[in-house]
């Protein structure tokens, strides 16, 4: 028969014959022969391969370096890489999460729209009319101005995006 020029899925062509690829979690040791199947061996401790492959070396698991603010979110297996995330108060600088930076705080006049996670930074929004924030915070939302009327008080000083209104007593009507 004619030697193959293409092979089925999960196979590779070598020496004019189709050999099985190694399954995820195993590396190629020796090609198949006319008489025997491909020789594959499991990846070692702290190594992985996540696809059907003909790699002669497994990949090292990612190291979550605590000096860069990283910690292990999900331990790697022979078929998957380790997933890193950031320590509390920090978030990844990229999708690959190779280092971390401190969560950003929202300045006075801005409130937290979305609290930061291990993989995303704080999202701030300007406080709209009727709301304020007088602190720099990574957690505080814009607070509504105090309603003087509900306290039977009147506005003595208008609020801004950074300050609350100041309420005071109503002027007594003179007899």
């Amino acid at each position: 028969p004619e030697p193959p020029t293409a092979c089925r899925e999960k196979q590779y062509l070598i020496n004019s014959q189709c050999c099985s690829l190694c399954q995820p979690g195993q590396k190629l040791v020796s090609d198949c022969t006319e008489f025997t199947e491909t020789e594959c061996l499991p990846c070692g401790e702290s190594e992985f391969l996540d696809t059907w492959n003909r790699e002669t070396h497994c990949h090292q698991h990612k190291y979550c370096d605590p000096n860069l603010g990283l910690r292990v979110q999900q331990k790697g297996t022979s078929e998957t890489d380790t997933i890193c995330t950031c320590e509390e108060g920090w978030h990844c600088t990229s999708e690959a999460c190779e280092s971390c930076v401190l969560h950003r705080s929202c300045s006075p006049g801005f409130g937290v729209k979305q609290i930061a996670t291990g993989v995303s930074d704080t999202i701030c929004e300007p406080c709209p009319v009727g709301f304020f924030s007088n602190v720099s915070s990574a957690f505080e939302k814009c607070h509504p101005w105090t309603s003087c009327e509900t306290k039977d008080l009147v506005v003595q000083q208008a609020g801004t995006n950074k300050t609350d209104v100041v309420c005071g007593p109503q002027d007594r009507l003179r007899a």
Epitope: I14, N15, L28, V29, S30, D31, T33, F35, T36, E37, E39, L41, P42, G44, R54, T56, H57
Partner: antibody, heavy 117, light 112 residues
Framework: EVQLEESGGGLVQPGGSLRLSCAAS????????MSWVRQAPGKGLEWVGT?????????DYASWAKGRFTISKDTSKTTLYLQMNSLRAEDTATYFC?????????WGQGTLVTVSS | DIVMTQSPSSLSASVGDRVTITCQAS????????LAWYQQKPGQAPKLLIY???TLPSGVPSRFSGSGSGTDFTLTISSLQPEDFATYYC????????????FGQGTKVVIK
């Protein structure tokens, strides 16, 4: 034709050195682990060591061979080598090269090494 | 280091006999199945008979079979033929960082 052919055996004095060669043909040498196995006269098979496929050529040796024996390969010449130093009388054996690591699919015919004064 | 213990060291049998050789590893082989059997005749290189504990290379007669997992393995010849008189070796593989392969001491099958 797929084959392995050893050479370089012979008589050597105790304490001496010898380099064995194994010429491979008929298969892709670069993507296959290669091993050495020896057999003393009238005795059983004994694994010497393995060199794995790939550019960095990781090696693994039997504990008794570490430090004295070194396996290497020249992919361009499709040749496997076994450098043997500080040879002793008990190293007298037929040395086989074989393809594979956890099982050996192809063997050479062997080359005899005699260590004697 | 992994140690392979093969038994018996020799056996005499007749053509047509069923022959069983056992092999025990001092610790589990890789993936519980990295165990091979080889046949060797005088003056010849060994020949792979069974790999991955129970897989026959194409061309090896079906009267040969292998079984077992972990530390205990068996080679069976269902009906011994004249060309089967030889020495048989098991070989277990531990890993690529701890003394790779170890052979059993061999079993010589002789004519009764």
């Amino acid at each position: 034709e797929v084959q392995l052919e050893e050479s370089g055996g012979g008589l050597v004095q105790p304490g001496g050195s010898l380099r064995l060669s194994c010429a491979a043909s008929g298969f892709d040498f670069s993507s296959n682990a290669m091993s050495w196995v020896r057999q003393a006269p009238g005795k059983g098979l004994e694994w010497v060591g393995t060199i794995y496929a790939g550019s960095n050529g990781n090696t693994d040796y039997a504990s008794w061979a570490k430090g004295r024996f070194t396996i290497s390969k020249d992919t361009s010449k499709t040749t496997l080598y076994l450098q043997m130093n500080s040879l002793r009388a008990e190293d007298t054996a037929t040395y086989f090269c074989a393809r594979g690591a956890s099982y050996f699919t192809l063997w050479g015919q062997g080359t005899l090494v005699t260590v004697s004064s | 280091d992994i140690v392979m213990t093969q038994s018996p060291s020799s056996l005499s049998a007749s053509v047509g006999d069923r022959v069983t050789i056992t092999c025990q590893a001092s610790e589990s082989v890789v993936s519980n199945n990295r165990l091979a059997w080889y046949q060797q005749k005088p003056g010849q290189a060994p020949k792979l008979l069974i790999y991955l504990a129970s897989t026959l290379p194409s061309g090896v007669p079906s009267r040969f079979s292998g079984s077992g997992s972990g530390t205990d393995f068996t080679l069976t010849i269902s009906s011994l033929q004249p060309e089967d008189f030889a020495t048989y070796y098991c070989a277990g593989y531990k890993s690529s960082s701890t003394d790779g392969t170890a052979f059993g001491q061999g079993t010589k099958v002789v004519i009764k």
